[in-house]
């Protein structure tokens, strides 16, 4: 025997209290598939989060971050501050590259300049903290 | 026991207003997201508007935007939904609703009245 439920569209959910009749999500909630027997709560973009995407009855809100912030992991569930290019974030904040490093965006960890000499090359162009060195012939 | 009384509503013709009233009990409104649904002929249940979170935040359905206003009586515990520029589209059967938050997170709403009939024509 069919699921009454399985008629139910992304939107709604199937309410027990209405004989499994398909109701209307209410504000604030969607259901992104058909079934569903409750709807789900809307993502709040708050604080340092800002909504890149408004919450409708079958999709949720989409967050991006506040400038000065970026995304970090599955669907932006944190923002981290941003740094200066040739600097890296740590638990104090904002620190230049270590001499022998460097980090060309404003996201990320400092890394180590490349060593020209293990591909028998010489150095074109001096690394900086912003950006790695050039090697040449 | 949660219980939701309707009234309020009536015929009127196009263009008229009406006021319509949720008196609730069981549980205390300003608590609560609270809200109405309507019922056309012949067709599903559609949000028509709610006062959401603690903070009195309010949604309405593009169709009513600018012509209908929810508010609510705290001291009384009772629901409003004021009417405005009525239009033969909003003849429906309006039921007071309460959001049901669930312990998993899942989001339902309660519709306990019998509703009241809201008729727009001339």
């Known amino acids: 025997l069919q699921d009454p439920c399985s008629n139910c569209p992304a939107g709604t959910f199937c309410d027990n209290n209405r004989n499994q009749i398909c109701s209307p999500c209410p504000p604030n909630s969607f259901s992104s598939a058909g079934g569903q027997r409750t709807c789900d709560i809307c993502r709040q973009c708050k604080g340092v989060f800002r909504t890149r995407k408004e919450c409708s009855s079958t999709s949720n809100a989409e967050c991006d971050c506040t400038p000065g912030f970026h995304c970090l992991g599955a669907g932006c569930s944190m923002c981290e501050q941003d740094c200066k290019q040739g600097q890296e974030l740590t638990k104090k904040g904002c620190k230049d590259c270590c001499f022998g490093t460097f980090n060309d965006q404003k996201r990320g960890i400092c890394r180590p300049w490349t060593n020209c000499s293990l591909d028998g090359k010489s150095v074109l162009v001096n690394g900086t903290k912003e950006r790695d060195v050039v090697c040449g012939p | 026991e949660v219980q939701l009384l309707e009234s309020g509503g009536g015929l009127v013709q196009p263009g008229g207003s009406l006021r319509l009233s949720c008196a609730a009990s069981?549980?205390?409104?300003?608590?609560?997201?609270v809200g109405w649904v309507r019922q056309a002929p012949g067709k599903g249940l559609e949000w028509v508007s709610a006062?959401?979170?603690?903070?009195?935040?309010?949604y309405y359905a593009e169709s009513v935007k600018g012509r209908f206003t929810i508010s609510r009586d705290n001291a009384k515990n009772t629901l409003y939904l004021q009417m405005s520029s009525l239009r033969a589209e909003d003849t429906a059967v309006y039921y007071c609703?309460?959001?049901?938050?669930?312990?998993?997170?899942?989001?339902?709403?309660?519709?306990r009245g019998q509703g009241t009939q809201v008729t727009v024509s001339s």
């Open positions: 069981g549980f205390t409104i300003s608590a609560e997201d």
């Open positions: 609703a309460r959001v049901v938050y669930h312990a998993g997170g899942g989001v339902t709403f309660d519709t």
């Open positions: 006062i959401l979170d603690f903070g009195g935040s309010t």
